[in-house]
Interface confidence: medium
């Protein structure tokens, strides 16, 4: 899925309101520098499509995240906020269905949840723009100039 | 514990540079936007710029955009900004400041900062 | 850049007195239903520290007598009851828009 057309705005008040508290409680007891960020992202759409990876897709070590508070809430935010969204995830929801029977918090999701956080971390805070400037790396940054 | 360690005063000439460092500990230092924030004697808060250090971007308060430069140095978690051309109304406490965890866009964690006298 | 006007500059107060500070910004600073004006203190010799996020949450062990309200441009910050330890400077700061601003601050003396 191509994320560029999501209102990122709208996503981002979701995940303010929510999800960032849904993810502290999924990490509570966990230290803050326990995990390396080894996952990172560029712009918004690539930071979404990193977040889609690592939320819903199962891994080796944990396969339990997409039944999560935090998971089903990043589901519903990217339905509504993003074009056509729901659509391409009707056949991978059917899959999920069938893999996951349990939700067991192993010391790799946790790790993965650390990533997930520095990520929307990204998502959220693409630095500062100048309206005209040379600074620009990213393409969807060009058309918000309104981060918030 | 997340903190930030800036290094020591500096007086220096018009004219010349100088190159502040800010030290970070207890997080982790490539997933946060860091901030430099100067305040002259008597004065407000006043935005430099910033440095994701993830991939070493920056952004700039276009009043310091020529002069100000923003760099970090991943393998010692420090973060640096060089100020050139300083002139008398360059004196000031500078700061380095982290952003917030989530995206709010506050800064939660502040250095000690670092007193720059520039005086012929 | 947006402006941010802070009243009163100075404001003369007592302990156990009620504080009301204000921020104006030249703009509204919400998006998305959310309003991006931070306050902070600061005391002499110190950094800035963070009181509200967002206009009206508490900062990290900031105590329930800081209060903070308002969306758009108008921006208040109310202490309660005033403790010998809140005289200082207070900063509104918002990041909607670039660049980053700060108001010029208000400076809450003892009377």
């Known amino acids: 899925y191509d994320f560029t057309n999501c209102d990122f705005e709208k996503i981002k008040a979701a995940y303010l309101s929510t999800i960032s508290k849904d993810l502290i409680t999924y990490m509570s007891g966990t230290k803050s520098t326990e995990f390396n960020n080894t996952v990172s992202c560029s712009n918004r759409p690539h930071c979404l499509t990193e977040i889609q990876s690592l939320t819903f897709n199962p891994t080796a070590g944990c396969a339990s995240l997409a039944k999560e508070m935090f998971a089903m809430k990043t589901k519903a935010a990217l339905a509504i906020w993003c074009p056509g969204y729901s659509e391409t995830q009707i056949n991978a929801t059917q899959a999920m269905k069938k893999a996951r029977k349990s939700k067991v918090t192993t010391n790799k999701c946790l790790e993965q949840v650390s990533q997930l956080q520095g990520l929307w971390r990204r998502f959220n805070r693409p630095l500062l723009k100048q309206q005209g400037s040379s600074d620009y790396k990213d393409d969807d940054d060009k058309h918000h100039h309104h981060h918030h | 514990e997340a903190q930030l360690v800036q290094s020591g005063a500096e007086v220096k000439k018009p004219g010349s540079s100088v190159k502040v460092s800010c030290k970070a500990s207890g997080f982790t230092f490539s997933t946060y936007n860091m901030h430099w924030v100067r305040q002259a004697p008597g004065q407000g808060l006043e935005w430099i710029g910033a440095?994701?250090?993830?991939?070493?971007?920056?952004s700039y308060n276009q009043k310091f955009k020529d002069r100000a430069t923003l760099t970090v140095d991943k393998s010692t978690s420090t973060a640096y900004m060089e100020l050139s051309s300083l002139r008398s109304e360059d004196t000031a406490v500078y700061y380095c400041?982290?952003?917030?965890?989530?995206?709010?866009?506050?800064?939660?964690?502040w250095g000690q900062g670092t007193t720059v006298t520039v005086s012929s | 850049d947006i402006v941010l006007t802070q009243s009163p500059a100075t404001l003369s107060l007592s302990p156990g007195e009620r504080a009301t500070l204000s921020c104006r910004a030249s703009?509204?600073?919400?998006?998305?239903?959310?309003?991006?004006m931070h306050w902070y203190q600061q005391k002499p010799g110190q950094p800035p520290r963070l009181l509200l996020y967002r206009a009206s949450n508490l900062g990290s062990g900031i105590p329930a007598r800081f209060s903070g309200s308002g969306s758009g441009t108008d921006f208040t910050l109310t202490i309660s009851s005033l403790e010998p330890e809140d005289f200082a400077v207070y900063y509104c700061q918002q990041i909607n828009t670039d660049p980053l601003t700060f108001g010029q601050g208000t400076k809450l003396e003892i009377k």
């Open positions: 440095i994701y250090p993830g991939n070493g971007e920056t």
């Open positions: 400041a982290r952003e917030d965890d989530y995206g709010e866009g506050y800064f939660d964690v």
């Open positions: 703009e509204s600073v919400d998006n998305s239903g959310l309003s991006f």
